[in-house]
């Protein structure tokens, strides 16, 4: 569900919404962080009908969200973060 | 007090079209994702299909996906369905259900008493 | 998607006894389940949301727990307004209900 990629590509998110998804229409979370081509962190969002969305980093629903899905994968619940480096 | 308030339901022929409505009041609507439930004569209950605060972002289970449109009218405090190419399958009681708010402890909380679809020659 | 395997499909029970009822997950639904009541010609009522939580007005004598992929609904001592039908939903993934338990009296 959270995916997490260092890339040097420049920014992806062109807007951001803070507009609350229901983690049960979320298929997966792709977090990228500041560096190299971007200045800020970006977050993006697959949902289920097929459509993406980049989310807000400070809005307050995804941060919660993320930490659950932290602690879930950090109790060793079927919830994997994925860590991947590309080049 | 909450109210949810289905109208629309009736006899269509397989193929013919049919459009839903919920009216809805003692809550603010456009604070809510919202859902259709449906329910076959003696059957248990099915998910149908769910909409987003401003009608922006819906879902809808596979076996509808092509001809149901959920859709809302916040002005209106109203929810609808609209259903095309319908099959037998498809006759149900048909509710409409509150589905989501930011926390979630609302999830399919209050629901309407329901309208009959059938769908016979 | 997920599956909900509901049991027993039905059950018969006399007023004062304690039921249970019992949902399986076919994945992890890490506790986003709710507990329905409804009876015949009604719309389901809520009794219990996220495993454990009971409904605003909801007697105590109904209860919820689980975990993981296994969940279950406690009635601790049956009264004559509880037989009816009781569905679990899953919210974990989309939406999927369980296919019902019909309670009976004995």
């Known amino acids: 569900v959270l995916e997490v990629y260092y890339t040097s590509l420049r920014c992806r998110c062109v807007q951001e919404s803070s507009v609350f998804i229901p983690r049960r229409f979320i298929d997966r979370i792709q977090i990228l962080p500041r560096g190299n081509g971007c200045p800020r962190k970006e977050i993006i969002v697959w949902k289920k009908n097929k459509s993406i969305v980049c989310v807000d980093p400070q809005a307050e629903w995804i941060q919660r969200m993320m930490e659950v899905l932290r602690k879930r994968s950090s109790s060793t619940l079927p919830v994997p973060v994925f860590k991947r480096k590309i080049p | 007090e909450v109210q949810l308030v289905e109208s629309g339901g009736g006899l269509v022929q397989p193929g013919g079209s049919l459009r839903l409505s919920c009216a809805v009041s003692?809550?603010?609507?456009?604070?809510?994702?919202m859902a259709w439930v449906r329910q076959a004569p003696g059957k248990g209950l099915e998910w149908v299909a769910s909409?987003?605060?401003?009608?922006?972002?819906?879902y809808y289970r596979d076996s509808v996906k092509g001809r149901f449109t959920i859709s809302r009218d916040n002005a209106k405090n109203s929810l609808y369905l609209q259903m095309n190419s319908l099959r037998a399958e498809d006759t149900a009681v048909y509710y409409c259900?509150?589905?989501?708010?930011?926390?979630?402890?609302?999830?399919?909380?209050?629901w309407g008493q329901g309208t009959l679809v059938t769908v016979s020659s | 998607d997920i599956q909900m395997t509901q049991s027993p499909s039905s059950l018969s029970a006399s007023v004062g006894d304690r039921v249970t009822i019992t949902c399986k997950a076919s994945?992890?639904?890490?506790?986003?389940l709710t507990w329905y009541q409804q009876k015949p010609g009604k719309a389901p009522k809520r009794l219990i949301y996220?495993?454990?939580i009971l409904q605003t007005g909801i007697p105590s004598r109904f209860s919820g727990s689980g975990s993981g992929t296994e969940y279950t609904l406690t009635i601790s001592s049956l009264q004559p307004e509880d037989f009816a039908t009781y569905f679990c939903?899953?919210?974990?993934?989309?939406?999927?209900f369980g296919q019902g338990t019909k309670l009976e009296i004995k």
């Open positions: 909409i987003n605060y401003d009608g922006g972002d819906t």
């Open positions: 259900a509150t589905e989501e708010d930011y926390d979630g402890s609302y999830v399919m909380d209050a």
């Open positions: 003692g809550f603010t609507f456009s604070d809510y994702y």
């Open positions: 994945q992890n639904i890490n506790k986003e």
């Open positions: 996220n495993t454990n």
């Open positions: 939903l899953q919210q974990s993934s989309l939406y999927t």
